[in-house]
Amino acid sequence: SERCDDWGLDTMRQIQVFEDEPARIKCPLFEHFLKFNYSTAHSAGLTLIWYWTRQDRDLEEPINFRLPENRISKEKDVLWFRPTLLNDTGNYTCMLRNTTYCSKVAFPLEVVQKDSCFNSPMKLPVHKLYIEYGIQRITCPNVDGYFPSSVKPTITWYMGCYKIQNFNNVIPEGMNLSFLIALISNNGNYTCVVTYPENGRTFHLTRTLTVKVVGSPKNAVPPVIHSPNDHVVYEKEPGEELLIPCTVYFSFLMDSRNEVWWTIDGKKPDDITIDVTINESISHSRTEDETRTQILSIKKVTSEDLKRSYVCHARSAKGEVAKAAKVKQKVPAPRYTVELACGFGAT
């Protein structure tokens, strides 16, 4: 056969679907690889062909579109399963071609099982709610296109295993779940089960997402440097190890990049000749506020090193701050014999 532009196996689009539920999978060619859509391609006389490779097999085979009740069908650039079976797992390829043009891409499809509490190997999207922020909501994801707007589905929401009914601060409103107050206790997995009729059959769509309650932007502050501070002086003798921690608190801010760095005499440690090491650790509060600690370490400090300026810097979307460490050379105590001699008036 003639050459075909092969985009390979698109593992970035690892598609997971639940067993025994409808699934509609769009050919990724039009979404991520080609500059034109299906309608344009179809108008230009291009044909979309689907085939697949079963799990643990190498043989590409055509998809059987003649199954009872049209269990697998194709509509425009969408491959439909009504419903999926466990052994539909495999690598699926969609190929767009005519006599002069060919382009194809493969993607993995995994059909996963869930238990009665909706636990499964499915990778869950995370939705962040601000703590104590006012009315916020989550929406049942990825259900568009499964039924026409004339069909009114029933939607049931669960937190973990429990149906949300009289949940006090959480109100089910069809496709939306409204949180009158978002609290730490609302952290967890929320599942919407959408039930709709089609051609005399009843189908269920199960969608689970993780809710994480995070710090409110109203409470967010610029970075706070807890250490170094004015109360601690790093007093060392030459030859000793100098350890200075820089500990910074960052309020949670959506999509903010939190940074901590040291400068020594105004330069980054990498840009100077001192043998300095910096170790970083990060911890998070329950609302994803972040504490970063960078420990600056000089194994054998020199008297020159003890005269340098050591400044900890921090930056977030809320602002930038800096704090200098108080470093000084320890004044050696007078030797005991000299002290005695002086005491007795020796010259």
Partner: antibody, heavy 122, light 110 residues
Framework: EVQLEESGGDLVQPGGSLRLSCAAS?????????MCWVRQAPGKGLEWVSC?????????YYASWAKGRFTISRDNSKNTLYLQMNSLRAEDTAVYFC?????????????WGQGTLVTVSS | DIQMTQSPSSLSASVGDRVTITCQAS??????LAWYQQKPGQAPKLLIY???LLASGVPSRFSGSGSGTDFTLTISSLQPEDFATYYC????????????FGQGTKVVIK
């Protein structure tokens, strides 16, 4: 005793302004509650005006007709709710009630004040 | 905006009667419905919230039902102190958050 007490109602000319207050006692404004204003014209039914979240965000919600003319606010340190009313019209004449909404109890409006009368007339 | 329509606007009943008031929302409000009782010169008093939950201290003769757009308040055996005006109140939290009241139902002595 847990209660709400409105004040600030008065006779005001059309086009004038007025600020209503609602002092809470027996409970603290906190992230559990929303505080709201509802009005009732003489001999008429209840009409929702506005709500504010008592938590740090202070998110506000208005009836479409109240947007722009009315402003809800609160001072948690004083445990007081306010309604600033501008460009007043004759049809704003009503008893104005403040109410507490318990966000931890399915949004129930569980506590109401006795109301303050606002009369807009020339 | 959501509109709440109550019926009837008034009704005459006797002590001991079973009374039913209905409330219809202009859009799906799920279970976001409350019922209030108001007596002349007084503030409204919460009876039912979340469509069917009885508020604290409210006698069990009051009950609420319904979801979506159609709701009902039932007083199983009318008592003398129940003669008052009753309001339904709907809420929508998703989308544009808003609350709205029905126009009221006045229950008078027959």
């Amino acid at each position: 005793e847990v209660q709400l007490e409105e004040s600030g109602g008065d006779l005001v000319q059309p086009g004038g302004s007025l600020r209503l207050s609602c002092a809470a006692s027996g409970f603290s404004f906190s992230s559990t509650y929303y505080m709201c204003w509802v009005r009732q014209a003489p001999g008429k039914g209840l009409e929702w005006v506005s709500c504010i979240y008592a938590g740090s965000s202070g998110s506000t919600y208005y009836a479409s007709w109240a947007k722009g003319r009315f402003t809800i606010s609160r001072d948690n340190s004083k445990n007081t709710l306010y309604l600033q009313m501008n460009s007043l019209r004759a049809e704003d004449t009503a008893v104005y009630f403040c109410a507490r909404v318990d966000g931890s109890s399915s949004g129930s409006w569980d506590l109401w004040g006795q109301g303050t009368l606002v009369t807009v007339s020339s | 905006d959501i509109q709440m329509t109550q019926s009837p606007s008034s009704l005459s009943a006797s002590v001991g009667d079973r009374v039913t008031i209905t409330c219809q929302a202009s859009q799906n409000i799920y279970s976001n419905l409350a019922w209030y009782q108001q007596k002349p010169g007084q503030a409204p008093k919460l009876l039912i919230y979340a469509a069917s939950l009885l508020a604290s201290g409210v006698p069990s003769r009051f009950s609420g039902s319904g979801s979506g757009t159609d709701f009902t308040l039932t007083i199983s055996s009318l008592q003398p102190e129940d003669f008052a005006t009753y309001y339904c109140q709907g809420a929508v939290y998703s989308g544009n958050t808003e609350w709205a009241f029905g126009q009221g139902t006045k229950v008078v002595i027959k």
